[in-house]
Interface confidence: low
C-alpha cells in the first residue's frame, strides 16, 4: 500500500483525485504532501 | 520573486565530508517539504532524501544508497535546508538540486533550484 | 523499490507533429506519477502532477494519462522549445524514483 505522505494526507483529506487551481503562498492549505518534488 | 539557492559543492576525496546548503526565499519556506534530487553528469535523476515540514515534525527519508551516510536537516528561521554528507563515495558525483512542493489540495507549487556540482575525486 | 521505464529513449519527431511519451510502473502506484522537462544545464520543469493534472503555466498541449502501472505523456503538436529530456516519477512508495528518461530530438 502506499505509505509516502502524500497518500497519507491525500487519504484523510478525500482528495485522491482533484482539479488544478490558482493559488497564493498565504493560502491556508487543507494539506501538504509530497505529490510531486 | 520565488528563489531556491543551492551552495556548498566542490571537489572532495573519497571518505570526505561536504554540507550543502539551499537558501529559499519568496515562499513560505516552514509549510514546504523538501528534497534533495541528484543528477550524475549525463545520466537521469535521483531522489535523495526528503524532509518534511515543521508542521510534520520535519520527518526525514532518505535514499538506500545514501542511508547512514546523509543527514537533511532544515533550519526554518534562517529559510534554509543542509544536506551534511558524509563518507563520500566516486558515484556521489553529481549536480544535487534543492525541490520544495507544497500541496494545496487544489493544486501544488513546485520550485528547485539550479543545483550545486559534487565532484569526488582523489 | 519501484522501477519506472520509459519508452522509447529517444524521439525524433519535427515541430507540429505529435509526440507521446510512455511510462510503466513495475508495481501498481495508483495515480502518483509526476512528469518534468529537463533541457541541457537547466533544473527539471514539473510539467504534469496526479498522472493527469498541468501544472501551473504549462500550455494545454502538454496532457498526461494512465492509472495504475501504464502512464502517457502527450504533446499534441510540438513547438521548437519542447524538445528535451522528459522523466517520470513516481510518489507512492519511498524511495521516491525516476524513470531513466526520453530524449525528445528534432528529426
Known amino acids: 500500500s502506499c505509505n509516502t505522505a502524500t497518500c497519507v494526507t491525500h487519504r484523510l483529506a478525500g482528495l485522491l483525485s482533484r482539479s488544478g487551481g490558482v493559488v497564493k503562498d498565504n493560502f491556508v492549505p487543507t494539506n501538504v504532501g509530497s505529490e510531486a518534488f | 520573486e520565488v528563489q531556491l539557492v543551492e551552495s556548498g559543492g566542490g571537489l572532495v576525496q573519497p571518505g570526505g565530508s561536504l554540507r550543502l546548503s539551499c537558501a529559499a526565499s519568496g515562499f513560505t519556506f516552514s509549510n514546504y517539504w523538501i528534497s534533495w534530487v541528484r543528477q550524475a553528469p549525463g545520466k537521469g535523476l535521483e531522489w535523495v532524501a526528503e524532509?518534511?515540514?515543521?508542521?510534520?515534525?520535519?520527518?526525514?527519508h532518505y535514499a538506500e544508497a545514501v542511508k547512514g551516510r546523509f543527514t537533511i536537516s532544515r533550519d526554518n528561521a534562517k529559510n534554509s535546508l543542509y544536506l551534511q554528507m558524509n563518507s563520500l563515495r566516486a558515484e556521489d558525483t553529481a549536480v544535487y538540486y534543492c525541490?520544495?512542493?507544497?500541496?494545496?489540495?487544489?493544486?501544488?507549487?513546485?520550485?528547485w533550484g539550479q543545483g550545486t556540482l559534487v565532484t569526488v575525486s582523489s | 523499490e519501484i522501477v519506472l521505464t520509459q519508452s522509447p529513449a529517444t524521439l525524433s519527431l519535427s515541430p507540429g507533429e505529435r509526440a507521446t511519451l510512455s511510462c510503466k510502473a513495475s508495481?501498481?502506484?495508483?495515480?502518483?506519477v509526476s512528469w518534468y522537462q529537463q533541457k541541457p544545464g537547466q533544473a527539471p520543469r514539473l510539467l504534469i502532477y496526479?498522472?493527469?493534472n498541468r501544472y501551473l503555466g504549462i500550455p494545454a498541449r502538454f496532457s498526461g494519462s494512465g492509472s495504475g502501472t501504464d502512464f502517457t505523456l502527450t504533446i499534441s503538436s510540438l513547438e521548437p522549445e519542447d524538445f528535451a529530456v522528459y522523466y517520470c516519477?513516481?510518489?507512492?512508495?519511498?524511495?521516491?524514483?525516476f524513470g531513466q528518461g526520453t530524449k525528445l530530438e528534432i528529426k
Open positions: 496526479g498522472a493527469s
Open positions: 524532509i518534511r515540514s515543521e508542521s510534520d515534525a520535519s520527518a526525514t
Open positions: 525541490a520544495s512542493y507544497f500541496d494545496y489540495g487544489l493544486a501544488i507549487q513546485n520550485y
Open positions: 516519477s513516481q510518489s507512492y512508495n519511498y524511495p521516491y524514483t
Open positions: 508495481k501498481r502506484v495508483t495515480t502518483y
